[in-house]
């Protein structure tokens, strides 16, 4: 593997801008407590995804197969981008800084049309599946704003389990307590470049 590290300005302020700028008008469904999966996203954001150590998340996707890599990109190589769709959870958040008006933000992550990252809690794996809306709960992740302009993605279906990096691949990683939320292998950077 070739290691050509070059540094981009990581776009973290944009997330806060999104949180502050959005005036959210909620559907009756949210008040009634129905699943958020049928509700339109409050905003969408196209960004490249990289690890705390600036390795890129890349996708090799065919009709019937895929690979998700965590790797150093070559200097001239364009970064893969994912479409992050933001949803506000109807459940109040106890944590500060993660959402708007004390509510949690959830995201879905899509590298291309009709495909989304899914949590497979049984296999502790992160998978790419072709899905139709409404998306299953396995495609939703609670977004946490962390230190150092990083974010982390917690499974909606399995609180305390996060998307992380294991052996140069994405995997689901159990985090025991909030003290360990800053563990580097679950921290990701979002960048417009």
């Amino acid at each position: 593997m070739h290691h050509h590290h070059h540094h981009h300005h990581h776009h973290a302020a944009g997330l806060n801008d999104i949180f502050e700028a959005q005036k959210i008008e909620w559907h009756e469904a949210a008040i009634e407590g129905r699943s958020i999966t049928g509700i339109s996203p409050i905003t969408e954001y196209l960004a490249s995804l990289s690890t705390y150590n600036d390795q890129s998340i890349t996708f090799a996707l065919e009709d019937e197969s895929y690979e998700i890599y965590v790797e150093d990109l070559k200097k001239d190589e364009k970064k893969d981008k994912v479409l992050l769709s933001y949803y506000e959870s109807q459940h109040p958040s106890n944590e500060s800084g993660d959402g708007v008006d004390g509510k949690m933000l959830m995201v879905t992550l899509s590298p291309t049309k009709d495909f989304w990252l899914h949590a497979n809690n049984k296999e502790h794996s992160v998978e790419l599946h072709k899905s139709e809306k409404p998306l299953p709960d396995q495609a939703f992740f609670v977004l946490h704003n962390m230190h150092s302009n990083c974010v982390s993605f917690e499974c909606k279906t399995d609180p305390g389990v996060f998307i992380g990096v294991k052996d140069n691949h994405l995997a689901l990683i159990k985090v025991d307590s909030s003290e360990n939320l800053s563990t580097e292998n679950i921290l990701f950077k979002l960048s417009e470049t």
Epitope: H2, L61, E62, K75, E77, T112, F115
Partner: antibody
Framework: EVQLLESGGGLVQPGGSLRLSCAAS????????MSWVRQAPGKGLEWVSA????????YYADSVKGRFTISRDNSKNTLYLQMNSLRAEDTAVYYC????????WGGGLRYPFGYWGQGTMVTVSS | LPVLTQPPSVSVSPGQKASITCSGE??????AAWYQQKPGQSPILVIY???KRPSGIPERFSGSNSGNTATLTISGTQDMDEADYYC?????????FGGGTKVTVL
């Protein structure tokens, strides 16, 4: 099984026009960027043009810019190359080629050619 | 656009190693692909992203890329490997091929 079948080649006079087609099957056509690559008799491969999966972005080699137009009809799973103002140096076998992987949101051209058609011969001569 | 330079021909005895180079400015900063083409046939992808083999391509094919040179290596060359080989990169959404190398198995 991925299959690409070119057609439309033939003999044409300099200054004339020709339209090549590439019928695709065995995959989700609209998900993949497609290219045309040509090979003059006894010569090497030359990339000619490419188009994104949606058809919204097109790309051309300098040697054909302004003369050739790439397009696609995703409802018919067909790729096209409209060739105008043909020159003797355009004489070649024309291959259509599919990207190895599905095009992502990032766009651009960066994947290798994973699948190739059998080619169609274009001869420009008076 | 980069000019990719390949040796016109390489000769190798059966069972021996054949190395084909592809030289271009800052080649190592890009991902190189290699294609095999036999007479009267369409090209076949044998190496992509410098080092990766598509399914169905024998392990004797390998690649590397650093500095200004990408290299395709065929270890234990067989008669069936006699063909033309082309390197290829993308540069600013333009496809660029090398001139091709004819590999002859003696």
């Amino acid at each position: 099984e991925v299959q690409l079948l070119e057609s439309g080649g033939g003999l044409v006079q300099p200054g004339g026009s020709l339209r090549l087609s590439c019928a695709a099957s065995g995959f989700t056509f609209s998900s993949y960027a497609m290219s045309w690559v040509r090979q003059a008799p006894g010569k090497g491969l030359e990339w000619v043009s490419a188009i994104s999966g949606s058809g919204g972005s097109t790309y051309y080699a300098d040697s054909v810019k302004g003369r050739f137009t790439i397009s696609r009809d995703n409802s018919k799973n067909t790729l096209y190359l409209q060739m105008n103002s043909l020159r003797a140096e355009d004489t070649a076998v024309y291959y259509c080629a599919r990207d190895l992987w599905i095009q992502l949101w990032g766009g651009g051209l960066r994947y290798p050619f994973g699948y190739w058609g059998q080619g169609t011969m274009v001869t420009v001569s008076s | 656009l980069p000019v990719l330079t390949q040796p016109p021909s390489v000769s190798v005895s059966p069972g021996q190693k054949a190395s084909i180079t592809c030289s271009g400015e800052r080649m190592g900063d890009k991902y190189a692909a290699w294609y095999q083409q036999k007479p009267g046939q369409s090209p076949i992808l044998v190496i992509y992203q410098d080092t990766k083999r598509p399914s169905g391509i024998p392990e004797r094919f390998s690649g590397s890329n650093s500095g200004n040179t990408a290299t395709l290596t065929i270890s234990g060359t067989q008669d069936m490997d006699e063909a033309d080989y082309y390197c290829q990169v993308w540069d600013s959404s333009t496809g660029v091929f090398g001139g091709g190398t004819k590999v002859t198995v003696l």
